[in-house]
């Protein structure tokens, strides 16, 4: 029951996490900037992985996509890649984990198969969460290290004077959503891996005994068939007699954990 709960909770936590990663990737507020209060209107600029938006004090908002790929910073491309890889791995992990859930019966799927699928999905969730955390952290690092921080400089071009506007970059909401979502996906993945251990069929803690009568005069001692129950005088599964009864390990060269009396 605890295994089912752990697996189910891991699935739900990962599902929420991946939904969060998708939301963060699509959000426009990765970085936010207040452009100086000019005489016409206060301008607020916020930028995401895919487009940039400008909001005026009147409430008017204009958003435009980054149509050129070549002009974009390599770091932004890396962040995009990390987030997409995180989403893809997470989505595949969710698909695998649905079939791995103990509460869902699909044909005659064995527990060992479900355990393997649970482990696979758990690893996928962990990698997905790490990708999201890495992506968000790379973007945040760019802001912290003033990678995009404008330095106040002037130069005269063909069309007159060009001045870089001094702006202060702050973390947008998408960064926090991404961190939390990545963390949840990571936690969900760990829970799935833990659940996998409980799902795996454990080794039988007794050796099955097969009896081969070698002659008519062989007498079976009481307790000979009680090895599997643990009752009776012969709980250690020792040979009861030498007249042909031997443990399965002595008969087969490749013992199996699924051998029963």
């Amino acid at each position: 029951m605890a295994v089912t709960a752990c697996q189910g909770l891991g699935f739900v936590v990962s599902l929420i996490g991946i939904a969060g990663i998708i939301a963060a990737t699509c959000m426009d507020q990765w970085s936010t900037q207040d452009l100086y209060n000019n005489p016409v209107t206060a301008v607020f600029n916020y930028q995401g992985l895919w487009r940039s938006c400008v909001r005026e004090s009147s409430g008017f908002t204009e958003c435009r996509g980054y149509f050129t790929l070549l002009g974009l910073p390599a770091m932004l491309q890396a962040v995009r890649a990390l987030m997409i890889v995180g989403i893809v791995l997470g989505a595949i992990g969710l698909l695998v984990s649905i079939f791995a859930l103990k509460c869902i019966r699909i044909g005659s799927m064995e527990d060992s198969a479900k355990a393997n699928m649970t482990l696979t999905s758990g690893i996928m969730f962990i990698v997905s969460g790490l990708c999201a955390i890495a992506g968000v952290s790379v973007f945040a690092n760019m802001l912290v290290t003033n990678f995009w921080m404008s330095t106040a400089n002037m130069y005269t071009g063909m069309g007159g004077m060009v001045q870089t506007v001094q702006t202060r970059y702050t973390f947008g909401a998408a960064l926090f959503v991404g961190w939390v979502a990545g963390g949840l996906t990571l936690i969900g993945g760990v829970m799935m891996c833990i659940a996998c251990r409980g799902l795996a069929p454990e080794e039988t803690n007794y050796k099955a005994v097969s009896y081969h009568a070698s002659g008519h005069s062989v007498a079976y001692k009481p307790g000979g068939f009680k090895a599997s129950t643990g009752f009776g005088s012969n709980t250690k599964n020792k040979k009861i007699y030498d007249g042909g009864a031997r443990t399965e390990d002595e008969v087969q060269s490749y013992p199996s954990k699924h051998d029963y009396v």
């Epitope: 940039s52 400008v54 005026e56």
Partner: nanobody, 120 residues
Framework: EVQVVESGGGLVQPGGSLRLSCAAS????????MSWYRQAPGKQRELVAG???????NYGDSVKGRFTISRDNAKNTVYLQMNSLKPEDTAAYYC??????????????WGQGTLVTVSS
């Protein structure tokens, strides 16, 4: 690189009209604000009029009711329609553009100016 080019200046009689144009080109993502400033000889540069992408306008006290600012967002162009011109409107008119040219790149670009002379 972002460039701003003004046009339309010239000599006009008092009471006359003139239309100035300013076009921005280059690596442009947004132009949140486009404005016109002027500087008369020996005086400080002052705001004539400004317009945002959303259509919010602001006029200098001395031109209210006489000048009209408009813009074409698709062409990244701003226009200044000047009516009932006075000799005190004589100045070099500069176009000022606030540009978001890329991710985290915010520029304030000034044109080289166009001369408007109001004289009989």
């Amino acid at each position: 690189e972002v460039q701003v080019v003004e046009s339309g200046g010239g000599l006009v009689q008092p009471g006359g009209s003139l239309r100035l144009s300013c076009a921005a080109s280059g690596s442009i993502l947004h132009i949140p604000v486009m404005s016109w400033y002027r500087q008369a000889p020996g005086k400080q540069r002052e705001l004539v009029a400004g317009i945002s992408t959303g259509g919010t306008t602001n006029y200098g006290d001395s031109v209210k009711g006489r000048f009209t600012i408009s813009r074409d967002n698709a062409k990244n162009t701003v226009y200044l329609q000047m009516n009932s011109l006075k000799p005190e409107d004589t100045a070099a008119y500069y176009c000022n553009v606030l540009v978001v040219s890329g991710i985290g790149s915010h520029l304030e670009v000034w044109g080289q100016g166009t001369l408007v002379t109001v004289s009989s």
